[in-house]
Amino acid sequence: ESGYAQNGDLEDAELDDYSFSCYSQLEVNGSQHSLTCAFEDPDVNITNLEFEICGALVEVKCLNFRKLQEIYFIETKKFLLIGKSNICVKVGEKSLTCKKIDLTTIVKPEAPFDLSVVYREGANDFVVTFNTSHLQKKYVKVLMHDVAYRQEKDENKWTHVNLSSTKLTLLQRKLQPAAMYEIKVRSIPDHYFKGFWSEWSPSYYFRTPEINNSSGEMD
């Protein structure tokens, strides 16, 4: 699905004191989905503020969020997953601001895990593998992954590789010899569902072999 190409227009300027953003996670706990919202301004006084979602729900008209410190959270099976929901910030019965959101367009996958790198001496390469809980899911099954790696001494010089599988081969000749590398991976929905990058996986660290001077090859 092509989705919408952006032409540079600004986002809807509902930048009042109660501007908020949300992300959904589908089948995050068995068949339960979650929706997490937070104010964009961390200084908002949230004491009497509540969040409510109405529309595109199964069997109920509206649901209230639970407050967990500075975030608002729902875990439920009741998302219809088709049509737009109205998410409102409320004080008592009064709505302060609302957004129409299709929950399938704000999906944030779970972070990949079990990232590892194995050096293959004969092939002169590194095989990067990782796992994702989404392989077992029924909705958000297809993801694009972003593998990022850098030489540990290069603070911000990350190299990124996009892939749809959970396995990547890095050629030894593309890496510096006898160097320590950091590698990490994150995921984003890639078929029908849209949304945000997951959190990064925990980083994995690996060292490249030194060059063997007699052959010009690395050890």
């Epitope: 919408y4 595109a56 299709d102 029924k138």
Partner: antibody, heavy 118, light 111 residues
């Protein structure tokens, strides 16, 4: 009530362009994407593309890429569909339709008849 | 492009009787329990009107004699008890993949 009101009928020569407007009312304009669907005489329905009035982002049917342009004007809650290099097979009723969800159409304009004839 | 094939092309049903329209897609339009199939009614000289979205969800204001079912590649629109005002052409539409395509239509008439 929620309404989409389209501009009037057009007669165009082959090779010309046509620009059809669709004015939305009765809801917050930036909350819903607006799409264009056409129907040739006695034929079925064909999706042409859509626009998100919030961002100006567009999605076009590949069949019309390069010939169709969709724009929106938030100050007047109006979207526009311009089709260029018209040919006789573009003779059709052009509908704008609001997307209630991804991507089904819950509110439709009354339609604009575009006739392409030499 | 996903091709939607409706059957029959036309249907004549007695008042009060059941009318059933089928829509078959060239590939699945379902993601688990999310069925991206929708149904519209179009009367002569009017724009289409949404009846059913997500295969089985009745649009607000649509009489409950209309119902939808199906998954994957096979979907059905049912009018449980045909009324005179139901004479129209009915279209299915998929929204899993761009370009979003419609069936060729089924004309429903009174027998």
């Amino acid at each position: 009530q929620v309404q989409l009101v389209q501009s009037g009928a057009e007669v165009k020569k082959p090779g010309a362009s046509v620009k059809v407007s669709c004015k939305a009312s009765g809801y917050r304009f930036t909350d819903y994407e607006l799409h264009w669907v056409r129907q040739a005489p006695g034929q079925g329905l064909e999706w042409m593309g859509g626009i998100d009035p919030k961002t100006g982002g567009t999605a076009y049917n590949q069949k019309f890429k390069g010939r169709v342009t969709m724009t929106s004007d938030r100050s007047t809650s109006t979207v526009y569909m311009e089709l260029s290099s018209l040919r006789s097979e573009d003779t059709a009723v052009y509908y704008c339709a609001r997307s209630g969800g991804r991507w089904y159409f819950d509110v439709w304009g009354q339609g604009t008849t575009v006739t392409v004839s030499s | 492009d996903i091709v939607l094939t409706q059957s029959p092309d036309s249907l004549a049903v007695s008042l009060g009787e059941r009318a059933t329209i089928n829509c078959r897609t060239s590939e699945s339009v379902s993601i688990h329990l999310l069925h991206l199939m929708h149904w519209y009614q179009q009367k002569p000289g009017q724009p289409p009107k949404l009846l059913i979205y997500g295969a089985s969800n009745l649009e607000s204001g649509v009489p409950d004699r209309f119902s939808g079912s199906g998954s994957e590649t096979d979907f059905t629109l049912t009018i449980s008890s045909l009324q005179a005002e139901d004479v129209a052409v009915y279209y299915c539409q998929q929204s899993i993949k761009d370009p979003y395509t419609f069936g060729g239509g089924t004309k429903v008439e009174i027998k």
